[in-house]
């Protein structure tokens, strides 16, 4: 079942188990939806002379893309279903604007940590972008949470605004990203 | 769209050497590893590495170690495969391949057929 | 190395068959999984990654399954343009090796 935590005075509110961010810059503003709207994949809406929002119900915009914060505990794999199943992927950090960004929203939540789109088959291998992207660590750095009994995390999370490894099976909050053309 | 578009056949002597390349298009370059993979004639489809286009990193097959190079000039976004001291047995359809989600190739080259004939 | 065994080497199937081909590596590699078609002359396609996700553009009758060790590309219905070979790759550990690749032919 999915959490429904609402308020009128604080920042962010959780409604069907998603966070929304009440920030009124570029974003987009929440409505009281059913969650049968909230997972409905939706394209980019046209515009007929009318201003409508290219992202589905309870997702922010920023720049070229919708971002859903979603508060259902899962597995990395399972959180990347869940993206899929709303038309989306695991959150991809694109630029240093994107990074700051997720920061600012996640930071409000800073007992949470939250799932993006980047993991290895094991540490030999290189991380890899859920597209198939290279990753580069000039954008940021993975701060490694590996130990002797635990010695293999190969997915990636964000806390606060430090980005970790962790064993892919742990469950936790995920962010998924759907691009739109303009 | 995404094109990977490679040179033309080639006819080596043993001992020789071969390099083959692999322009890409319709997606940034850099973002994406390159594989290479081989197909000897009637036979399977083999491995042989992949070059990070944005780094130039790679990653060669033990089997090919010494005597493979993989190298890319970003600015025609081109990838190229060297191998050199050919022998007979590496007469194959060579393809270069752009990678996709879980490190599968999601986009293959037309492939370059290399004879290796005395 | 991990070495990828695939089984049948070969098939004879009609059109409109559900065919079953299992792979099998030599440890385990998770999900990291590939299955490709490919016809004779031709580059192979990707069909599935992930052990079981489909490559856009890829019709739904193909499916891939399992984890692990053991994998199963399915073909709910075969279609003539279906009669190829099919290959398994894991990208788990360098070098990321194929399967010998088993042949799917008109009965």
């Known amino acids: 079942t999915m959490a429904i935590w609402r308020s009128n005075s604080g920042s962010n509110t959780l409604e069907n188990g998603y966070f929304l961010s009440r920030n009124k810059e570029n974003h987009s503003q929440p409505t009281q939806s059913s969650l049968e709207d909230s997972v409905t994949p939706t394209k980019a809406v046209k515009t007929t002379g009318v201003l409508s929002s290219p992202c589905p119900p309870n997702w922010i915009i920023y720049e070229k893309s919708c971002y859903l914060f979603s508060m259902s505990l899962n597995s990395w794999d399972g959180s990347k279903r869940q993206c899929w199943q709303l038309g989306s992927n695991l959150l991809k950090i694109d630029s240093s604007n994107e990074l700051g960004f997720i920061v600012k929203q996640v930071s409000s939540q800073p007992d949470n940590s939250f799932w993006i789109g980047l993991s290895r088959p094991q540490t030999e291998v290189p991380w890899l972008w859920e597209d198939g992207s290279t990753f580069s660590s000039n954008l940021f750095q993975i701060r490694t949470t590996a130990t002797q009994e635990n010695p293999s995390p190969n997915c990636v999370w964000i806390h606060v605004s430090v980005i970790y490894d962790q064993l892919c099976s742990v469950p936790s909050y995920s962010i998924c990203e759907k691009k739109f053309s303009m | 769209q995404v094109q990977l578009v490679q040179s033309g056949a080639e006819v080596k002597k043993p001992g020789a050497s071969v390099k083959v390349s692999c322009k890409s298009s319709g997606y940034t370059f850099t973002d994406y590893y390159i594989h290479w993979v081989r197909q000897a004639p009637g036979q399977g489809l083999e491995w042989m590495g992949w070059?990070?286009?944005?780094?130039?990193?790679?990653n060669y097959a033990q089997k090919f170690q010494g005597r493979i190079t993989m190298t890319r000039d970003t600015s025609i976004s081109t990838a190229y495969l060297e191998l050199s001291r050919l022998r007979s047995d590496d007469t194959a359809v060579f393809y270069c391949?752009?990678?996709?989600?879980?490190?599968?190739?999601?986009?293959w080259g037309q492939g370059t057929l290399v004879t290796v004939s005395s | 190395d991990i070495q990828m065994t695939q089984s049948p080497s070969s098939v004879s199937a009609s059109v409109g068959d559900r065919v079953t081909i299992t792979c099998r590596a030599s440890?385990?590699?998770?999900?990291?999984l590939a299955w490709y078609q490919q016809k004779p002359g031709k580059a192979p396609k990707l069909l599935i990654f992930g052990a079981s996700s489909l490559q856009s553009g890829v019709p739904s009758r193909f499916s891939g399954s399992g984890s692990g060790t053991d994998f199963t590309l399915t073909v709910s219905s075969l279609q003539p343009e279906d009669f190829a070979t099919y290959y398994c790759?894991?990208?788990?550990?360098?070098?990321?090796?194929f399967g010998p690749g088993t042949k799917v032919d008109i009965e």
């Open positions: 440890q385990g590699i998770s999900s990291w």
């Open positions: 391949a752009r990678n996709s989600g879980s490190y599968s190739a999601g986009y």
């Open positions: 790759q894991q990208a788990y550990s360098f070098p990321f090796t």
């Open positions: 070059i990070n286009p944005n780094s130039g990193d790679t």
